[in-house]
């Protein structure tokens, strides 16, 4: 039987046994956190479903998610945002260890689709597990990229109070204008409940003494900020080791010189 | 009436071949994920094999197939197959097909009756 | 040997309650979605549970299912002796990308 044709991207097709993964993520997590027992994962399933089947892979829209954000809608308490640009694994070690902060990929939604991919066909009610439109060589307005644009607009606009944010220190540029957090977080903190986004700047050489928050990029991220009327705060987190030992035991008397 | 129903099973020399056919009616096949799961005589059930809903391009095995088993399916002819090489006396079982219900968490919810294999010289 | 392990054997008076135990690792109970089977003599396996702890259309709520952690279990209550079967709980296991039953438990009603 010849299969029938299918439009071939550049990108990786769907993660494999991606409907059964979402919903076991979806089941652990609503088991894990109390507050999100009464979450049905079969309805998540069908919102997050609906957003992608059946549409054409390079025309999806904020408003495609819509449901699906209304099912997993939560809040952050004040002070207990972390975002992250480039630095993903460790902005996730520090938030499994000081457990009353939390990144993106700590809520809902992130927790579901971290590190997925997905996509549809036009006018077909199947997954494609072949290939997926590339942000750059395809389009931009695919299934995943524009699940993230809308999660991580959410995300910084439910933020209040002290907004912390881990920037890569070995990157050419620490703070990336293009990057979801300089696109869309930095644009949708909101300055009425927002005070202050403090920047933790992350060193990747073991002798690097530098202090990168003077690094022109980190510096453009400060005018940025400062003209939406939110004060900037930066941090030198020389070594990311020990600022993670730290945070695991904070009593630890090497811990009372810097990190 | 949700029906899966296996053929293919027999007596074959170890070292041969056997076609395992699983027949599917009252669902829409495409849309699920299937399995193939045995039993060896007096013992429990063992995963075989699965094949991803659709097209079927996400194949897996279990260790002790691999490399001699191939699962495929034929969504318009509503047929599950197991293409069984380089048979071994182990791989002596009653081989069942059954669908994962996504509906159900990916739960077995729909079994066949089973198709008996017997590998011996 | 089955990275899912059940006890081989159960047993029970008509009328008591019996759990069955299905241990693993943070590779397949942890993550992933438990379902459990029961099998009559010389049939085909049934679905019991899914999800853990949900139960299909048509399984009395005498047979519930729970998991904690790296373990789940299901227990029978008010025991029948029709209940005499084999049961396996069965999972994805991301190790060995594939899925994976328990050994299995016969249960006996005495």
């Known amino acids: 039987v010849l299969p029938r044709w299918r439009q071939q991207w550049s990108g990786s097709g769907t993660t494999s046994r991606f409907p059964e993964t979402v919903l076991a993520r979806c089941v652990k997590y609503t088991e894990v956190h109390p507050e999100m027992r009464h979450v049905d994962c079969q309805s998540v399933w069908d919102a997050f479903k609906g957003a992608f089947i059946s549409k054409y892979p390079c025309n999806i829209t904020e408003e495609d998610y819509q449901p699906l954000v209304k099912l997993g809608t939560q809040t952050v308490p004040c002070n207990k945002t972390l975002l992250w640009s480039r630095i993903k694994d460790l902005a996730h070690q520090f938030t499994q260890v000081q457990r009353d902060m939390f990144t993106l990929e700590d809520m809902l939604l992130g927790y579901l689709a971290d590190d997925l991919t997905w996509c549809g066909e036009f006018n077909t009610f199947e997954i494609n597990y072949q290939s997926c439109p590339d942000w750059r060589k395809d389009c931009s307005n695919n299934p995943v990229s524009v699940f993230w644009k809308t999660v991580s607009r959410r995300f910084a606009e439910t933020a209040c109070g002290v907004v912390h944010v881990m920037l890569n220190g070995s990157r050419s540029k620490i703070f990336d204008k293009n990057s979801t957090f300089g696109s869309v977080e930095v644009h949708n903190l909101q300055p009425e409940k927002v005070q202050a986004l403090e920047a933790w700047v992350i060193h990747g050489g073991r002798e690097d003494s530098r202090d990168l928050c003077q690094d022109p990029t980190i510096k453009e991220l400060e005018s940025i900020i400062s003209k939406r009327n939110i004060r900037f705060f930066c941090k030198n987190i020389y070594r990311p080791d020990k600022f993670l030992q730290c945070v695991k035991n904070p009593e630890d008397s090497s811990c009372l010189s810097g990190i | 009436e949700v029906q899966l129903l296996e053929s293919g099973g027999g007596l074959v020399q170890p070292g041969g071949s056997l076609r395992l056919s699983c027949a599917a009616s009252?669902?829409?096949?495409?849309?699920?994920?299937m399995s193939w799961v045995r039993q060896a005589p007096g013992k429990g059930l063992e995963w075989v094999s699965e094949i991803s809903e659709s097209d079927g391009s996400n194949k897996y095995y279990a260790d002790s197939v691999k490399g001699r088993f191939i699962i495929s399916r034929d969504n318009s002819k509503n047929t599950l197959y197991l293409q069984m090489n380089s048979l071994r006396a182990e791989d002596t079982a009653v081989y069942y097909c059954?669908?994962?219900?996504?509906?159900?968490?990916?739960?077995?919810?729909?079994w066949g009756q089973g198709t008996t294999v017997t590998v011996s010289s | 040997q089955s990275v899912l392990t059940q006890p081989p054997s159960a047993s029970g008076t008509p009328g008591q309650r019996v759990t069955i135990s299905c241990s693993g690792s943070?590779?397949?109970?942890?993550?992933?979605?438990v379902s459990w089977y029961q099998q009559l003599p010389g049939t085909a396996p049934k679905l019991l549970i899914y999800r853990h702890d949900h139960r299909p259309s048509g399984v009395p709520d005498r047979f519930s299912g729970s998991k904690s952690g790296t373990s789940a279990s299901l227990a029978i209550s008010g025991l029948q002796s029709e209940d005499e079967a084999d049961y396996y709980c069965?999972?994805?296991?991301?190790?060995?990308?594939?899925?994976?039953f328990g050994g299995g438990t016969k249960l006996t009603v005495l």
């Open positions: 059954a669908r994962l219900e996504p509906e159900k968490y990916y739960g077995m919810d729909v």
């Open positions: 943070n590779s397949n109970i942890g993550n992933n979605l």
């Open positions: 009252g669902f829409t096949f495409d849309d699920y994920v």
């Open positions: 069965a999972t994805w296991d991301d190790s060995l990308n594939g899925r994976a």
